[in-house]
Interface confidence: low
């Protein structure tokens, strides 16, 4: 008993363990190409059941803590392994031994307090390695990366604990596309630590202080093409000559993000430029300038050494005392050769005229998200300002008058492109003046309701997206591209307005339809985006879309953005999938189809009637109904005649000479109805037949081969047969003048055939001795 109990508990434990392991396996979702997603599944270990078919495995945001040496052994073909934020604190030395094909490894934001070179030894194919956000102080006792000869991207360091960069750290790395080092708590930089990497395309350094900046700068001068400094307080930065020989630095771009500068430290930074003569781009993002712009480059040689800088970008520059800011006259000469300047979202309200005039080479100026108004813009764009300017972006400023803006910019003789989007303009006037070379105008998000001839006819590209336009009727003979999405247009604009239009984007309007004629009327249209409109899926629109498979070549957002708005039956269906209602769209086809079907039905019914004697049934029904409708002639209904005699003309001799003699001259005499004698002249034969049968007590059928062949006899038999069914009486008396084959009697006379089968008929005997008995029987039958 005790043993059985133990066995039971062991089985329960195995089941629980097995079910846990299985559930982990089940919650790993893999696609056909071997990409497996196991993010946020609460795994506490690497799941079992991994296979060589897996190419990518993402186990981020779990609680794995530990990776054992056999956990990943089955993943011989794994190329991507992502273990971000999985609380990993321990990795066995040979945990990655089978991952020779691995190209991407992300171990960021875990709890690895020390790093081991044995992890990376087998990873000869590795191109991307992210070790950032782990609480290590150094990169390990020995070099981590000597075998990673294919490495292109390396991210290391953390915010709090990574404090030392040593010479051995980057041994074996000769060339990197990206190197990111987060060392906000750096306390020691060993000289020449970064010098061993001969080529770094993009180096990002997160340094909180500038203490080691000069040493690092000296080491990377000959290797880095793009240096990005993040979160660095440069307020106390002081230049001192670098301990380097004459060097030709490949550095092309220098970016400061989240840095703090002062007027003085800016001057000091400028001195670094003498070492990077090829620098062409400088960028400041989210920086703070604790100063007034009182820059005073002390060394005259700095001025000429800034010569190759062509692009200066400043975004979200915070100047606490921006209202006291200097006119920058001290740096005018520094910027004479700059071609592109962006100063975005930095509270700019004026570019002094003299400064604008010094920007002789400037071709592109972006002053988006600032405080420019027409009054100050006039000063900025004074005579001789920005003489080479081709593109001006004044998006999201405080401009109000389109007319004034155009007039102010007339001084810019080379301006071809103007972006004044996201300004709230007054209603557009009828006429405006613009720089004569202007080809591109962006008026998106300006609240305009009507477009007028204020817009220049020289335009090749016009963007009026996200406004309140409900029509567009402006002739623009050179327009090649029209962006008019997010407005209220109900139809496509008239094609004759844009004879050379190539591209039109008219998404999110109120366009309900477009047709072959409309699209065909744009002679050069190559690209149309018209999705997310309120399409009425009419017969014409749907048949056009069904008949035009080439739509996908013109409509770049076809088919997913083209949905029916109405009729309700098709609401939400893609135009491509919507099928028009046959009732609504194919009435002619439907009517002709129904007619054809009816004709076929009639033919079918006709054929069936012919085959199953339907006409006979109809005639009988009609005759019967007629008979029913006639008023009963009271005195004569059952007593006019004792019997109606139905016979063939060929048997008239027997009837008239024998039967009539025997029955009408007997005692008591029988009154017989004969067609020759008693039918009403001028009355339809069939009516005579019906009337006679109706007025006779019995109907005597004189059957012979002649009778069966006679058409009128058949009618008489028809109606009598009908009466037999209807009234369920024995009104018919059959007299067989000669033997008839039963087959000769038509199928439809089922009762007659039954009577013949059951021998309830009188047979005319050829033996004269028996003929008297025949007459007695006939008289009895008529009387009954």
């Amino acid at each position: 008993m005790l043993r059985a109990l133990w066995l039971f508990w062991i089985l329960v434990a195995i089941t629980v363990l097995f079910s846990k392991r299985c559930s982990a396996q089940e919650s790993l979702s893999c696609d056909a190409s071997g990409v497996c997603d196991g993010r946020s599944r609460s795994f506490t270990s690497i799941p079992s059941g991994l296979t060589a078919a897996m190419k990518s495995l993402d186990l981020s945001f779990n609680k794995i803590t530990y990776i054992g040496h056999g956990d990943l052994r089955a993943c011989a073909n794994l190329q991507v392994l992502i273990l971000k934020s999985s609380r990993i604190n321990t990795i066995e030395g040979d945990a990655f031994y089978s991952l020779g094909s691995l190209e991407h490894l992300d171990l960021s934001d875990n709890h690895l307090s020390s790093l081991s070179s044995s992890w990376f030894g087998p990873l000869s194919s590795l191109k991307y390695l992210n070790l950032m956000g782990n609480p290590y102080q150094t990169l390990g006792v020995t070099s981590l990366f000597p075998n990673l000869t294919n490495l292109q991207t390396l991210r290391i360091g953390n915010v709090e604990t990574f404090s030392e960069i040593r010479r051995i750290d980057f041994a074996g790395l000769t060339s990197l596309n990206e190197l990111e080092i987060k060392a906000l708590s750096l306390r020691n930089y060993q000289s020449q630590s970064l010098k061993s990497i001969r080529d770094i395309h993009h180096l990002t350094l997160h340094l909180s202080e500038s203490a080691f900046l000069l040493e690092i700068f000296a080491d990377i001068l000959s290797s880095v093409r793009y240096l990005e400094l993040r979160d660095t307080n440069l307020a106390r930065f002081q230049f001192s000559p670098l301990p380097v020989d004459e060097v030709s630095s490949p550095m092309k771009k220098l970016a400061f993000r989240g840095s703090v500068l002062t007027d003085e430290s800016f001057n000091e930074l400028l001195k670094l430029l003498r070492y990077i003569l090829e620098l062409s781009e400088v960028e400041f993002d989210d920086c703070t300038l604790n100063g007034l712009g009182d820059f005073n480059p002390s060394e005259s040689d700095v001025v000429s050494e800034l010569g190759k800088v062509e692009t200066v970008t400043i975004r979200r520059l915070h100047i606490p005392q921006f209202y006291l800011f200097y006119d920058l006259s001290t740096v005018y000469s520094l910027l004479e050769k700059v071609k592109r300047i962006t100063v975005e979202n930095s509270k700019v309200f004026l570019v002094p005229c003299s400064f604008s005039q010094h920007l002789k080479s400037l071709e592109f100026l972006d002053l988006s998200e600032n405080l420019m108004v027409e009054e100050y813009l006039k000063n900025s764009a004074c005579k001789g300002a920005w003489p080479s300017l081709q593109t001006l972006v004044l998006s999201q400023n405080h401009l109000r008058s389109m007319q004034k803006t155009g007039e102010i910019l007339l001084t810019l003789k080379n301006l071809t492109s103007l972006d004044i989007s996201r300004n709230t303009f007054h209603p557009m006037p009828d006429s405006c003046q613009w720089p004569e070379k202007m080809r591109f105008l962006n008026l998106s998000s300006t609240g305009i309701r009507v477009v007028k001839t204020c817009i220049p006819q020289t335009l090749e590209v016009l963007d009026v997206s996200n406004n309140n336009l409900d029509s567009f009727s402006l002739f623009l003979p050179r327009l090649q591209e029209l962006y008019i999405s997010r407005n209220k247009l109900k139809t496509l604009p008239d094609a004759s307005l844009f004879p050379v239009l190539l591209v039109m984007k008219i998404r999110e309007n109120a366009v309900s339809t477009f047709s072959k004629d409309q699209l065909g009327s744009f002679p050069k249209l190559e690209t149309l985006e018209a999705g997310d409109n309120h399409f009425v899926c009419s017969c014409e629109l749907l048949s056009f879309t069904m008949e035009t498979p080439a739509l996908a070549q013109i409509l770049v957002d076809w088919p997913d953005s083209y949905l029916c708005d109405s009729p309700p039956r098709l609401h939400g269906h893609r135009l491509q999938d919507a099928r028009p209602s046959v009732l609504e769209c194919h009435q002619a086809a439907l009517v002709s189809g129904v007619c054809c079907a009816l004709l076929l039905l009639i033919l079918l019914v006709g054929a069936l009637c012919h085959h199953f004697h339907g006409l006979w049934y109809l005639r009988m029904m009609w005759a019967w109904l007629q008979a029913k409708r006639k008023p009963k002639k009271a005195p004569c209904r059952d007593v006019c005649y004792d019997a109606f005699v139905s016979y063939s003309e060929q048997d008239s001799h027997w009837v008239e000479n024998l039967m009539v003699q025997q029955l009408e001259n007997s005692d008591p005499p029988f009154k017989l109805c004969l067609h020759k004698r008693d039918f009403v002249p001028g009355k339809w034969i069939i009516d005579n037949i019906i009337d006679s049968i109706e007025k006779s007590h019995k109907t005597v059928f004189v059957l012979s081969e002649n009778f069966v062949r006679s058409e009128w006899c058949k009618y008489e038999l028809d109606f009598s047969h009908f009466r037999l069914f209807d009234e369920n009486n024995d009104a018919a008396i059959l007299v067989l003048l000669e033997p008839i084959e039963r087959k000769a009697i038509p199928q439809r006379f089922c009762k007659l055939r039954k009577i013949m089968n059951t021998k309830t008929y009188l047979e005319w005997p050829l033996d004269e001795g028996q003929q008297e008995v025949f007459w007695v029987n006939l008289r009895t039958a008529i009387k009954s």
Partner: nanobody, 116 residues
Framework: EVQLVESGGGLVQAGGSLRLSCAAS????????MAWFRQAPGKERQFLGS????????NYADSVKGRFTISRDNAKNTMYLQMGSLKPEDTAVYYC?????????WGQGTQVTVSS
């Protein structure tokens, strides 16, 4: 902003072929589409074709359809114009242009001369 540099122009015999490149740098992530234009002496700038950055779909002017092909290399942020069956009337300065939904950027142009 986006900077564009064209290259690959030069002298070529009629009937020959040439491949132009347009390398984009700067704010390339914002590019919506890129296009090729050309301008012959004394004539207006002419659209040749464009490529959408989102899905690589291309469009061509009738005059070059079938002879010119536009493609791009995503990794290099470069657009190409493969020109075949060149004619003397294809002689022009070839420009590339990018559009980011807000702003147009032009390259400096590269000269293509087709000799008969």
């Amino acid at each position: 902003e986006v900077q564009l540099v064209e290259s690959g122009g030069g002298l070529v015999q009629a009937g020959g072929s040439l491949r132009l490149s347009c390398a984009a740098s700067g704010r390339t992530y914002s590019i919506d589409s890129m296009a090729w234009f050309r301008q012959a002496p004394g004539k207006e700038r002419q659209f040749l074709g464009s490529i959408l950055w989102s899905d690589d779909s291309t469009n061509y002017a009738d005059s070059v359809k079938g002879r010119f092909t536009i493609s791009r290399d995503n990794a290099k942020n470069t657009m190409y114009l493969q020109m075949g069956s060149l004619k003397p009337e294809d002689t022009a300065v070839y420009y590339c242009r990018s559009w980011d939904g807000r702003q147009v950027y032009w390259g400096q142009g590269t000269q293509v001369t087709v000799s008969s």
